[in-house]
Amino acid sequence: MRRGPRSLRGRDAPAPTACVPAECFDLLVRHCVACGLLRTPRPKPAGASSPAPRTALQPQE
C-alpha cells in the first residue's frame, strides 16, 4: 500500500543511495528503510480524493 522504491542521496553522501524495492529513503536517518515505516502516501481507489496532489516521482525520490 505504501509508495514503492525510491532512490535518494544522503545529505552528506557523494553519490545517490539506491533503495531496493519495498525500501524508501529516510531523510532523517539518511538510509533506506522499509517503506511501511514511513508515513508515505497510500494509493486510494479510483475516484477517491487524495490527501495531497502527488507529482510523478522524480528518479531521485
Epitope: R3, L8, R9, G10, R11, D12, A13, P16, C24, F25, D26, L27, L28, V29, G36, L37, L38, R39, T40, P41, P51, A52, R54, Q58, Q60, E61
Partner: antibody
C-alpha cells in the same frame, strides 16, 4: 483521516515539569515520525523534537537536557515532558505528524496553551 | 541550524490586492538528492498551522490557485494573487532539507489595511 489531540494541564508552576499527551487516531505511531512543536507569544515556532517509528528520539539542542519524548504504542499515544520550566516556556504546544515523502508536517493537533506562572 | 528569515513581519493589504512574502535561508536548501524541501504554512486565528505549499511550488490539496510559491537555493517567495478575507493569518516558511532540527521562519502576519 489522521487526527491528533493534545491534552494536559494548562497551568504549570515555575520549576515544575510540563507533561503533555498526544493521542493519535487514524494511523499508527509505529509508522513515521511524531513531533512536538511549540509557538511562543509573538508567533515564533520552535521545533522541539520527535519520536520515530522505532522509538528513537531527537531533541532540539536548544532545550538541552530538559526534554523527554516517550510513547505507548498500545494506546497509540506519545508524550512530552519538559523539566524545570520557566515563564519563557509559556507557549501553545502542538503535536504533529510528518509526511515521509516530502517531509512536511501534514497533520497537526489543535494545540494546547500552557502558561507557566506561580 | 538553518536560520529562516521572513519578510515582512506584518503585511497590511486590501482585499483583492496581491501579497508577496519573502523567505531566505542561511544555507542553500537544495538537498544532495536534488530536491528543495521548502514549505509554506498558514495559521489562521485560533487554528493550528496548515500546509499550503510543499517543495517550493506545489500546492497542497484544496489550496486555491491564487497561492503560488517560487524560488531556489536560499531565496523563496509566496505570492497571493488576489487576497481574500479567508487568507488572513500568519504565514510561515519551513525547511526540511538540513534536519533535524526542522526550522521555521519568524512568520508574516497578513492583515487588512
Amino acid at each position: 483521516d489522521v487526527q491528533l489531540q493534545e491534552s494536559g494541564p494548562s497551568l504549570v508552576k515555575p520549576s515544575q515539569t510540563l507533561s503533555l499527551t498526544c493521542s493519535v487516531t487514524g494511523d499508527s505511531i509505529t509508522s513515521g515520525y511524531w513531533n512536538w512543536i511549540r509557538k511562543f507569544p509573538g508567533n515564533k515556532l520552535e521545533y522541539m523534537g520527535y519520536i520515530s517509528y522505532s522509538g528513537s528520539t531527537y531533541y532540539n539542542p536548544s532545550l538541552k537536557s530538559r526534554i523527554s519524548i516517550t510513547r505507548d504504542t498500545s494506546k497509540n499515544q506519545f508524550y512530552l515532558q519538559l523539566l524545570s520550566v520557566t515563564t519563557e516556556d509559556t507557549a501553545t504546544y502542538y503535536c504533529a505528524g510528518l509526511d515521509g515523502l516530502y517531509w512536511y508536517f501534514d497533520v497537526w493537533g489543535a494545540g494546547t496553551l500552557v502558561t507557566v506562572s506561580s | 541550524d538553518i536560520v529562516m528569515t521572513q519578510t515582512p513581519l506584518s503585511l497590511p493589504v486590501s482585499l483583492g490586492d496581491q501579497a508577496s512574502i519573502s523567505c531566505r535561508s542561511s544555507q542553500s536548501l537544495v538537498h544532495s538528492n536534488g530536491n528543495t524541501y521548502l514549505h509554506w504554512y498558514l495559521q489562521k486565528p485560533g487554528q493550528s498551522p496548515k500546509l499550503l505549499i510543499y517543495k517550493v511550488s506545489n500546492r497542497f490539496s484544496g489550496v486555491p490557485d491564487r497561492f503560488s510559491g517560487s524560488g531556489s537555493g536560499t531565496d523563496f517567495t509566496l505570492k497571493i494573487s488576489r487576497v481574500e478575507a479567508e487568507d488572513l493569518g500568519v504565514y510561515f516558511c519551513s525547511q526540511s532539507t538540513h534536519v533535524p532540527p526542522f526550522t521555521f521562519g519568524s512568520g508574516t502576519k497578513l492583515e487588512i489595511k
